[in-house]
Interface confidence: low
Amino acid sequence: PHLRTFTDRFQTCKVQGAWPLIDNNYLNVQVTNTPVLPGSAATATSKLTIIFKNFQECVDQKVYQAEMDELPAAFVDGSKNGGDKHGANSLKITEKVSGQHVEIRAKYIGTTIVVRQVGRYLTFAVRVPEEVVNAVEDWDSQGLYLCLRGCPLNQQIDFQAFHTNTEGTGARRLAAASPAPTAPETFPYETAVAKCKEKLPVEDLYYQACVFDLLTTGDVNFTLAAYYALEDVKMLHSNKDKLHLYERTRDLPGR
Amino acid sequence: SPCKILKCNSEFWSATSGSHAPASDDTPEFCAALRSYALCTRRTARTCRGDLAYHSAVHGIEDLMSQHNCSKDGPTSQPRLHTLPPAGDSQERSDSPEICHCEKSFHKHSATPNYTHCGLFGD
């Protein structure tokens, strides 16, 4: 999936299986990514687990779990708030669109999380105070925490190189790691550009991610995934000048 | 059956006296009844998988909300146990007056914390 880190780095990660996105004293978020096509390097998020840790007299530990085709509007225990404690309503789930869009507000840590199902896959966005991000007991153990550190170099796809290579060709090749030859017919480059332009008129990294996803999978739902990801940034990012990210130097692939 | 959708339905019908086409001046009350109905369906969601009435209700509530221009946030027609939180950029606003430090414990050192964002999407 495409990752925008806390430090506004933009990467395309091919990480498969379960990986931690966030891990601190208050909150643990883990995603499971699966290949979008058999044998493909590109992966998308098929499962998301969020653990709100027990906090003083505010909230009991609560676990939220979403999977493909299952975006509940409740924690796994069926509740919609922080439990039986005095401040239980400082943690709340709101269903914005049934089965498609859920918002979780953890006011006791000033955090808002947006989870969506777009097409078959999940998207995740969070707004969190730096103070919470930094509330970690043991920094040495924070090695593979994607939102903070990004994904390892060997797990990144240089989708901008792919973008450059495929311009005008309609090719399906995925730089150093191509999707399975059995991939369904994908879009010609021009069609992908047109579809992405429709939803994402600014040619930023969200637009480029959209083009990459259409060329890789042929699944138009990924256009919406990029669109909603940008919409969530607009709602959640505190620096309105940093809504759009653009291609910078080539030292960090996909940044 | 643990699925309480028929209870939700009957509460909605009681609240609206069976009217699906309220006069324009009834719309706020109708919207409040719809929001209560939506809340009721959400509370019974986990026990209603596969229940035809539940899925009909969920789709229908969305239809009716848009038909009558009801906002998703706002008062409900039952006691306001869980009004939806205000949308947008207002993470620090309190939902209810009785919650004290649980609302603000994360920024005890600074009036307005520095927020940061992380997102994951697509392939």
Partner: antibody, heavy 120, light 109 residues
Framework: EVQLVQSGAEVKKPGASVKVSCKAS????????ISWVRQAPGQGLDWMGW????????NYAQKLQGRVTMTTDTSTSTAYMELSSLRSEDTAVYYC?????????????WGQGTLVTVSS | QSALTQPRSVSGSPGQSVTISCTGT?????????VSWYQQHPGKAPKLMLY???KRPSGVPDRFSGSKSGNTASLTISGLQAEDEADYYC?????????FGGGTKVTVL
Amino acid sequence: EVQLVQSGAEVKKPGASVKVSCKASGYTFTSHGISWVRQAPGQGLDWMGWISPYSGNTNYAQKLQGRVTMTTDTSTSTAYMELSSLRSEDTAVYYCARVGSGPYYYMDVWGQGTLVTVSS
Amino acid sequence: QSALTQPRSVSGSPGQSVTISCTGTSSSVGDSIYVSWYQQHPGKAPKLMLYDVTKRPSGVPDRFSGSKSGNTASLTISGLQAEDEADYYCVSYAGTDTLFGGGTKVTVL
């Protein structure tokens, strides 16, 4: 125009399976459930079950549990009903019907019907 | 044996009113707002005439009306016309089952 178009007539032997399709057009397929109803010759209507194309959730009539499978393909807006271990009493016209969207339940649009004949 | 009981047939002259009853239990009809009625002409697919006991979809003439008393729902056709000759089925949704009546043949004399 909202329409449900069903597959053509089938003749099957006892013990076999039949799969009837129902292609929807003119509306958002995932916004409405699909019910299946059958009618034996000269008899009344008999409800078989329901599927939500949105979630894939199904709800089958008790007496058909284990023999009926309802599926949908949202990419083609098509619902399918498969009935296995066919017997002569399964000879009937099989209808698909759209479940009206709302906090109300009814079948507001029907397919033209598919005659399934089970005969040795 | 249907879960909802309807008379096998009713008849009336053009212009007259006829009423078809549909009797069930408290859970299938009495407490249900999900009672609908369908018209079926020979060799044709059923057509929705009423839903939620009393509501008429657009395109259905206002001579068709519905009501419910206790565990019995009723469909009334007032000002009977030749094209109303058909089979009529009541349907109720109860719990997780959809129940059909046995059907009533309406004959226009």
